[in-house]
């Protein structure tokens, strides 16, 4: 069964900077990736980035840069412009559309006790969904 993993990481040098890393574990070719925050795609989440393997990548504030890390993983850099840190308690969700498997989504967030530079563990379950 395909799996999606999500890691949320606070940058050690920039406490207002976060990076979301997501990957797809499974066969098939990825046709589109969407990264949302505040909940899963279509369930209250707001899309922050859309990545297509050949057409390009798009992101919207507070996302700074979306990029493919490998053929099956992506990263999204976020800049927290506010004085407080809303990202610390936010859920980020990554949805991978692949052929012929369909869509798979998983969510993750920064653990409350995270030290800068440490990552949240991969969280492929409880919001793993196949459309």
């Amino acid at each position: 069964t395909p799996e999606v993993w999500v890691q949320v990481q606070m940058e050690a040098t920039e406490l207002s900077s976060f990076t979301v890393h997501c990957g797809f574990l499974g066969p098939g070719s990825i046709s589109l990736v969407t990264v949302s925050w505040g909940g899963p795609d279509g369930a209250g989440g707001t899309k922050l980035a859309v990545l297509h393997p050949e057409l390009g990548t798009r992101q919207w504030a507070p996302a700074r840069q979306a990029r493919w890390e490998t053929q099956s993983s992506i990263s999204l850099a976020l800049e927290d412009s506010g004085a407080s840190s809303p990202f610390a308690n936010t859920t980020f969700c990554c949805k991978f559309a692949s052929f012929p498997e369909g869509s798979w989504e998983s969510c993750g967030s920064l653990p409350p006790s995270s030290d800068p530079g440490l990552s949240a563990p991969p969280t492929p379950v409880p919001i793993l969904r196949a459309d």
């Epitope: 589109l32 969407t34 949302s36 989440g45 707001t46 899309k47 859309v50 297509h52 393997p53 050949e54 057409l55 390009g56 798009r58 919207w60 504030a61 990029r67 493919w68 890390e69 490998t70 053929q71």
Partner: antibody, heavy 114, light 113 residues
């Protein structure tokens, strides 16, 4: 297949503002993320910016910051581009296109003339 | 901003001929992570909006005839039409799909003798 229907031609006076619309009817969410592109007469294409219907957030080409304002009404699937302080340099055909430019509207001709 | 330079600015060919047009970018359009080139080609016929022909430098959009072929990597790209047809009369633009602002080349005008 997605259809992008743009509003009709506009003739406006210098200094005025205008708002162009682009209604998307599609079946995937990417059909509602809209780019705007300018094509001056006999010239190439210039990307103005794009708008995200989830957040109403927009990305702009620095050249068009302060000139264009991009918004979207998610409920109706309509994107809007406002252009302010118009001059003859703004006379052009303006296109809307889907997120990765795979579908385009028919274009809206803007003429700025006194 | 990434500058896209197309050449030649115009081509005048007979039906059935093979044509090539060039597009050069001022920065690499290759994404090192997935080894894909974010370069697109568009065809614009008179009085019509542009139409996506090729993306990822070499992938034909659905419905595009196989006489259209995209090639190249990094900063140098080519669009080839293997056997030009009368209906190919159009302007052809390349576009940087790699990074904002998504700049277009100046275009190559294809005219049929």
């Amino acid at each position: 297949e997605v259809q992008l229907q743009q509003s009709g031609p506009e003739v406006v006076k210098p200094g005025a503002s205008v708002r162009i619309s682009c209604k998307a009817s599609g079946n995937t969410f990417t059909d509602f993320f809209i780019n705007w592109v300018k094509q001056s007469h006999g010239k190439s294409l210039e990307w103005i910016g794009d708008v995200n219907p989830d957040s109403n957030g927009a990305n702009y080409n620095q050249k068009f910051k302060g000139k264009a304002t991009l918004t979207v009404d998610k409920s109706s699937g309509t994107a809007f581009m406002g252009l302010r302080s118009l001059t003859s340099e703004d006379s052009a055909v303006y296109y809307c296109a889907t997120l990765f430019f795979d579908n385009w509207g028919q274009g809206t001709t803007l003429t700025v003339s006194s | 901003d990434i500058v896209m330079t197309q050449s030649p600015s115009s081509l005048n060919v007979s039906a059935g001929e093979k044509v090539t047009m060039s597009c050069k970018s001022s920065q690499s359009l290759l994404n090192s992570g997935n080894q894909k080139n974010y370069l697109a080609w568009y065809q614009q016929k008179p009085g019509q909006p542009p139409k996506l022909l090729i993306y990822g430098a070499s992938t034909r959009e659905s419905g595009v005839p196989d006489r259209f072929t995209g090639s190249g990597s990094g900063t140098d790209f080519i669009l080839t039409i293997s056997s030009v047809q009368a209906e190919d009369l159009a302007l052809y633009y390349c576009q940087n799909a790699h990074s904002s602002p998504y700049t277009f080349g100046g275009g190559t005008k294809l005219e049929i003798k």
